[in-house]
């Protein structure tokens, strides 16, 4: 039997090709030169090496590049990327968007793995900010990417990048994230006319303050209930019945179905019952007529 460290006669690899598919792990180790592998990395992804065979190829590259792989190799890792650990990836310097795309393609259709998260982190930090092209790419592969960032990380997103954001990219964002994104979106879309502006800003409105909602109520926007239910409660509470009616337009009838849910429930509690009755929806729970409303929070602020 051939000693496991020696390459059998005639099996030394002259190039990376399909015949290597039949090599046992020890044969790959003994018969494939690491430098040859590195220079022909573009061929590796064209050959369906098994997961176990990829272990050997990775080991060879690790020995050749102990400080981290060069981008010329990273770009062609293909399925070998699945074998990389976050620790491996932290040694890389990925600057090309094409390299990023190539590696994300390998993981396509899967959850964002720790490896992918580390890769993206390295890439974005290298660029200094989350530019539009990068955001375009990341949200195409991971619609939930934006909402996986902390408010601090989101603060590095330039307003110009907001144009790349689709409504579904914000589905899992919480209010703290929308608080950061909304002002950027407002800035990005400021030169659009009323109806176009509303279409673009709508998915960011979970971060909008009261004064912006009041302004929107003057523009016949007909906000749907789903959007209204995502608004910040503290931004909705000061709105008058007339303002909510204008804001929702024909969708105002939907308030009845949502009267037990926030922010509608809390808003109802702040309105005069008389004013609620003008909607003709049978909303109950408003302030009875003749009662005086004291805003204690305002009083505390004044003292």
């Amino acid at each position: 039997e051939v000693e496991k460290t020696a390459c059998p006669s005639g099996k030394k690899a002259r190039e990376i090709d399909e015949s290597l598919i039949f090599y046992k792990k020890w044969e790959l180790e003994a018969c494939v030169d690491a430098a040859l592998l590195a220079t022909q990395m573009d061929r590796v992804n064209a050959i369906p090496f098994t997961y176990e065979q990829l272990d050997v190829l990775k080991h060879k590259l690790d020995e050749l590049y102990p400080q981290g792989y060069p981008e010329s190799v990273i770009q062609h890792l293909g399925y070998l990327f699945l074998k990389m650990s976050p620790e491996d990836i932290r040694k890389w310097n990925v600057t090309s968007l094409e390299t990023l795309k190539a590696l994300l393609e390998v993981n396509k259709g899967h959850e964002m793995s720790p490896q992918v998260a580390t890769l993206i982190d390295r890439f974005v930090k290298g660029r200094g900010q989350l530019d539009k092209d990068t955001l375009d790419t990341l949200t195409a592969f991971y619609p939930g990417y934006l909402c996986s960032l902390s408010p601090e990380e989101l603060s590095s997103v330039p307003p110009s990048s907001i144009w790349a954001v689709r409504p579904q990219d914000l589905d899992t964002c919480d209010p703290r994230q929308l608080d950061v994104l909304y002002p950027k979106a407002r800035l990005a879309f400021q030169n659009m006319n009323g109806s176009e502006y509303f279409v673009k800003i709508q998915s960011f409105l979970g971060g909008a303050p009261t004064e912006d909602l009041k302004a929107l109520s003057q523009q016949n926007v007909s906000m749907d209930l789903a959007t209204f239910m995502k608004l910040r409660t503290d931004a909705v509470l000061p709105l008058t019945v007339a303002e909510v009616q204008k804001l929702l337009g024909p969708h105002v009838e939907g308030l009845k179905a949502e009267e037990r849910h926030r922010p509608v429930r809390d808003w109802i509690l702040r309105q005069r019952q008389d004013d609620l009755d003008t909607l003709g929806l049978g909303l109950q729970g408003g302030i009875p007529n003749g009662y005086l409303v004291l805003d204690l929070s305002m009083q505390e602020a004044l003292s």
Partner: antibody
Framework: QVQLVQSGAEVKKPGASVKVSCKAS????????MHWVRQAPGQGLEWMGW????????IYYEKFQGRVTMTVDKSISTAYMELSRLRSDDTAVYYC?????????????WGQGTLVTVSS | DIVMTQSPDSLAVSLGERATINCKAS??????VAWYQQKPGQSPKLLIY???TRHTGVPDRFTGSGSGTDFTLTISSLQAEDVAVYFC?????????FGAGTKLEIK
């Protein structure tokens, strides 16, 4: 959804050749390696080899080398497996199958099979 | 080539009872093992991969286990529709090889 539809049963004489087709639909034909597997009556499964429809690259199992030819026609999303110099022990159901993740070569989708009978 | 040896060749189990099928690899294959179910007149269907990961839509009564050289497919509570031939396959290295199959019947 992914579908692999194979050609009908064949009866061949020893020494002849047979060409089995496999029409793919429901996915991008050039994206996945197409494998061929055969099953002799009442027997286990035997892997024969693969072709990548995008590059036409092929790999054949040693046992079939020189007798098998795998080809594709991208324009009609169809793969072919031709086996020549047939012997009676080539009587089997021949399956085409695709593997979604090449590094994990498990057979995710199979054709319905084509029975090839070799008899004099 | 890696040889996959399945046992038993056939198995008869009462409805609702547990069925266990074994597969032994001639070399260490890690967890690179898949299991297939083949009903009469049909093509095989993937049940389990990575030795223990259930394929989409496979009922949880099917469980795979093992690593290295010894693998097991267990059906916790046999149903009438589980009557079939079951095959193991290794994908640790090429050529890809299968077990000879275990025919599962109702007692």
């Amino acid at each position: 959804q992914v579908q692999l539809v194979q050609s009908g049963a064949e009866v061949k004489k020893p020494g002849a050749s047979v060409k089995v087709s496999c029409k793919a639909s429901g996915y991008t034909f050039t994206s996945y390696w197409m494998h061929w597997v055969r099953q002799a009556p009442g027997q286990g499964l035997e892997w024969m080899g693969w072709i990548h429809p995008n590059s036409d690259n092929t790999i054949y199992y040693e046992k079939f080398q020189g007798r098998v030819t795998m080809t594709v026609d991208k324009s009609i999303s169809t793969a072919y497996m031709e086996l020549s110099r047939l012997r009676s022990d080539d009587t089997a159901v021949y399956y085409c199958a695709i593997i979604i993740t090449p590094v994990v070569p498990k057979f995710d989708y199979w054709g319905q099979g084509t029975l090839v009978t070799v008899s004099s | 080539d890696i040889v996959m040896t399945q046992s038993p060749d056939s198995l008869a189990v009462s409805l609702g009872e547990r069925a266990t099928i074994n597969c032994k690899a001639s070399h260490d294959v890690g967890t690179s093992v898949a299991w297939y179910q083949q009903k009469p007149g049909q093509s095989p269907k993937l049940l389990i991969y990575w030795a223990s990961t259930r394929h989409t839509g496979v009922p949880d009564r099917f469980t795979g286990s093992g690593s290295g050289t010894d693998f097991t497919l267990t059906i916790s509570s046999l149903q009438a529709e589980d009557v079939a031939v079951y095959f193991c396959q290794q994908y640790s290295s090429y050529p890809l090889t299968f077990g000879a199959g275990t025919k599962l019947e109702i007692k």
